[in-house]
């Protein structure tokens, strides 16, 4: 008789999830000498232990602590780039500006980027059919709790000037319900962080509005100011030119506003 299996609203665990996590870990530790000491099989065991055999709506940050401990990594605290709803450009930027780091440039972020996973209560099985959706099912699911945990730690580590890339094409440029708005903003440490600088990325070529005056940006400024952190904002009118100028700062066209 086939065992009854919970049907969730979200997509199931990414195909070959364990193999993908292990392979990414090996690749990352080969590329980053400071993480060569990491034992990828133990990392996978800790990752597995956070969600296997547990109800996928009952996951806690505590479940991920063994993994957090194994993945402890020091990044320059003044070189952190946060992002919201504009991941691809943020990653393209740190690929060029190699001394700046998004969460996905760290081991734990790199392991889990774009993956989905969940288990089932009281079985050692990974659920490849469906996983809980944050809105429709539950917020304390393995993926959401993982990103909440690593995002909080990443924000807590930041110092000096912290940059955040925001998507100017969205109706809410700053969204209080995003990971940035609900986790990272509230975990920046005022005693370490002097300024949060927002880069608002424009979508349309002819868009010359000052999106730093957008009501949601003003809301972000208010939240940040109340936390005794300074706020500044820049429009990035031409993201393609912006990346080009990061690559070739000597280019004569890079002296004008981008």
């Amino acid at each position: 008789v086939p065992r009854w299996r919970q049907q969730w609203s979200g997509p199931g665990t990414t195909k070959r999830f364990p193999e993908t996590v292990l392979a990414r870990c090996v690749k990352y530790t080969e590329i980053h000498p400071e993480m060569r000491h990491v034992d990828c099989q133990s990392v996978w065991d800790a990752f597995k232990g956070a969600f296997i055999s547990k109800h996928p709506c009952n996951i806690t940050e505590e479940d991920y602590q063994p993994l957090m401990k194994l993945g402890t990594q020091t990044v320059p605290c003044n070189k952190i780039l946060l992002w919201s709803r504009i991941k691809d450009l943020a990653h393209q930027f740190t690929q060029v500006q190699r001394d700046m780091f998004t969460l996905e440039d760290t081991l734990l972020g790199y392991l889990a980027d774009d993956l989905t996973w969940c288990g089932e209560f009281n079985t050692s099985k990974i659920n490849y059919q469906s996983c809980p959706d944050w809105r429709k099912d539950c917020s304390n699911n393995p993926v959401s709790v993982f990103w909440k945990t690593v995002s909080r730690r990443f924000a807590e580590a930041a110092c000096d000037v912290v940059h955040v890339m925001l998507n100017g094409s969205r109706s809410k440029i700053f969204d209080k319900n995003s990971t940035f708005g609900s986790v990272e903003v509230h975990n920046l440490q005022p005693e370490k962080v002097q300024t949060l600088e927002a880069w608002v990325i424009h979508g349309g070529r002819e868009d010359s509005r000052d999106l730093c005056q957008d009501p949601t940006i003003k809301e972000l400024e208010s939240i940040i100011s109340k936390r005794n952190i300074q706020f500044s904002c820049k429009n990035i009118y031409r993201p393609d030119k912006f990346l080009q100028c990061v690559k070739n700062p000597e280019d004569s066209s890079c002296t004008s506003e981008i």
Epitope: P18, E19, L22, D39, Q41, S42, D45, K48, S53, S124
Partner: antibody, heavy 120, light 107 residues
Framework: QVQLVQSGAEVKKPGSSVKVSCKAS????????FSWVRQAPGQGLEWMGR????????NSAQKFQGRVTITADKSTSTAYMDLSSLRSEDTAVYYC?????????????WGQGTLVTVSS | DIQMTQSPSSLSASVGDRVTITCRAS??????LAWYQQKPEKAPKSLIY???SLQSGVPSRFSGSGSGTDFTLTISSLQPEDFATYYC?????????FGQGTKVEIK
Amino acid sequence: QVQLVQSGAEVKKPGSSVKVSCKASGGTFSSYAFSWVRQAPGQGLEWMGRVIPFLGIANSAQKFQGRVTITADKSTSTAYMDLSSLRSEDTAVYYCARDDIAALGPFDYWGQGTLVTVSS
Amino acid sequence: DIQMTQSPSSLSASVGDRVTITCRASQGISSHLAWYQQKPEKAPKSLIYAASSLQSGVPSRFSGSGSGTDFTLTISSLQPEDFATYYCQQYNSYPRTFGQGTKVEIK
């Protein structure tokens, strides 16, 4: 039908090395991990280490670190265990055993065992 | 390392008896526990995985239970071919560790 066939018995002098092989057939070699477990005469089972062939990574129990090297050759579907600086306490039957990469299950298949005798 | 402690270390029983072997982990291992049967001069054979799931081809008289730190292997009605040594093993973390074994002998 999955089979793990190990190399034959060995008699070694203290201080020397031994290399035991484990050839897998009847399954996808790269989809699994291979562990080495030993059993001294009249004693229990002791896990030595594990290799994941498709990643080329291995780890071993701290007790054996620096003495054991676990490798795999994907082209011949063979896992190897090399134990150096042998002493009399290493006299044991050495088993290879297969598990899934995610290790969400047990060792489902075992080799027949290889007796290694260390004696001067 | 996680220590696995089995009890008893040996027991005598008759054909048809109900036999229970326990295994305790020194820290929580969820349900990442396997049971193996080993006969003299033979390789171990997997009986139970995930604490309570029966390996295919294993008779239903074998069952496993437990989660966290305390686990049990039960043979509901001992058969002549069941006289052997039984080992528990955790696969929650490295290094993988086994219990010291329980020898089931004929009374």
